[in-house]
Amino acid sequence: FNISGCSTKKLLWTYSTRSEEEFVLFCDLPEPQKSHFCHRNRLSPKQVPEHLPFMGSNDLSDVQWYQQPSNGDPLEDIRKSYPHIIQDKCTLHFLTPGVNNSGSYICRPKMIKSPYDVACCVKMILEVKPQTNASCEYSASHKQDLLLGSTGSISCPSLSCQSDAQSPAVTWYKNGKLLSVERSNRIVVDEVYDYHQGTYVCDYTQSDTVSSWTVRAVVQVRTIVGDTKLKPDILDPVEDTLEVELGKPLTISCKARFGFERVFNPVIKWYIKDSDLEWEVSVPEAKSIKSTLKDEIIERNIILEKVTQRDLRRKFVCFVQNSIGNTTQSVQLKEKRG
């Protein structure tokens, strides 16, 4: 098809070799008169169009993406040739940065339903450059975590070294939808909820004497639980005595609940106390038996091949520890009567 009628947008992706960046292109279709596919509410020139832009389409994935080879060859279907580029609904997602991503990307509806739709396409000229200036060594990460229940902020990586005062107007999107009230280089979140998680895109315009282009960065935002303030608690054994049969094998299980910690180094071990002596026992490896966002339950067993008289005089102690502190639970064996 003839792409000369496509509306054109220029974008710049400046990536750092130190960060784990991705990139997205939205299929930003224009609004030719009478086109049902590219239909959206009429906007005044000052308004920014809202994404996702397919208000008239029943199926948001009803768009085709192409790359225009620089040598003038026919347009290539993105899905067939580029494994590091994936299409998610009407968004093109680049999983790895690199100058080889530079080029022209065209999107248009899959179904051409009227003559007006022929020109219903967008050509995005993407320039990809590695970051050269080392002036901003500590720019914001392209993956940012917010702690649930606390205040937080999401920074635009390409502008995070600039003060709010000198920052240009920024257009923010979350999961492809325009966040119309956000215009600064940082989104401040008063209280973090699960719904703040998502893929955020920050755009700003850069110009020179010849032309202007959109500088874009993508931020993956995750909402996570804050570190626990509690030491682990032992769920089992509950009782401090255990009835046993002499000469029989015995397994005592220690189950402990550890609260979430970003740097998680749980300790769970068994040791034996016999009068003034105590020593750690070599036991099977600990295993995680339940893992949730807030905590993890870990189990470690002590195995006695057969219970002896000597074992009845000993205390078997389960010791658990995290970065906050430790807890112990001791078990005394008692011979079963009758």
Epitope: E20, L95, Q144, R222
Partner: antibody, heavy 115, light 112 residues
């Protein structure tokens, strides 16, 4: 391709450096990882060195291992190995850029820590 | 750190059958999950990345799904060659709060 070397029998407390030699791979374009596997056990992630030369480690591996690179090699230094460090050590190349899915692996080199 | 819990530890199924392996992350990792296959004496082989994208050359009998904290690998029309240990891996990477990469404990698939 990737090939690990330097695996040997070492006594606890000694120092050991493993080398991953790459061919046909531009190390400025890929994150490189070290992963180990104790005999009969699962895969254990140690850490990576990214395209810009920054190293990141699993929390248990911090201070015990150091990853560095040249234009054609990626090194893993094991400081004060213990018997628990006995394993096959693999180096792996990321899918591209600073990613953590690894689509090219070396055959591995065996490190045995024993008295 | 992130804890990846894989279940079951071992599963047996007949040729032509279907196997489902589950992987749970201790915190959300969106779609940053990979699946690997490892046969004895060999390094792991990447099967799926980004939770559901099939690596080039991997048969479509392998299917990855899930997002957030719960993920599944389904192998249908089992073949003898599928007998191996399968690992999930969190590939989230580095954020402002830490470094999140790690493997599940593995699932041994035995084909009868």
């Amino acid at each position: 391709s990737l090939e690990e070397s330097g695996g040997r029998l070492v006594t606890p407390g000694g120092s050991l450096t493993l080398t991953c030699t790459v061919s046909g791979i531009d190390l400025s374009s890929y994150t490189m990882a070290w992963v180990r596997q104790a005999p009969g056990k699962g895969l254990e992630y140690i850490g990576v060195i990214n395209t810009g030369g920054s190293a990141y480690y699993a929390s248990w591996a911090k201070g015990r291992f150091t990853i560095s690179k040249t234009s054609t090699t990626v090194d893993l230094k094991i400081t004060s190995p213990t018997t628990e460090d006995t394993a096959t050590y693999f180096c792996a190349r990321s899918y591209g850029g600073n990613r953590y899915d690894f689509n090219i692996w070396g055959p591995g080199t065996l490190v045995t820590v024993s008295l | 750190d992130i804890v990846m819990t894989q279940t079951p530890a071992s599963v047996e199924a007949a040729v032509g059958g279907t196997v489902t392996i589950k992987c749970q992350a201790s915190q959300t990792i969106t779609s940053y999950l990979a699946w690997y296959q490892q046969k004895p004496g060999q390094p792991p082989k990447l099967l799926i990345y980004r939770a559901s994208i099939l690596e080039s050359g991997v048969p479509s009998r392998f299917k990855g799904s899930g997002s957030g904290t719960e993920f599944t690998l389904t192998i249908s029309d089992l073949e003898c060659a599928d007998a191996a240990t399968y690992y999930c891996q969190c590939t989230y990477g580095t954020t402002n709060t830490g470094h999140y990469v790690g493997f599940g404990g593995g699932t041994e698939v035995v084909v009868k």
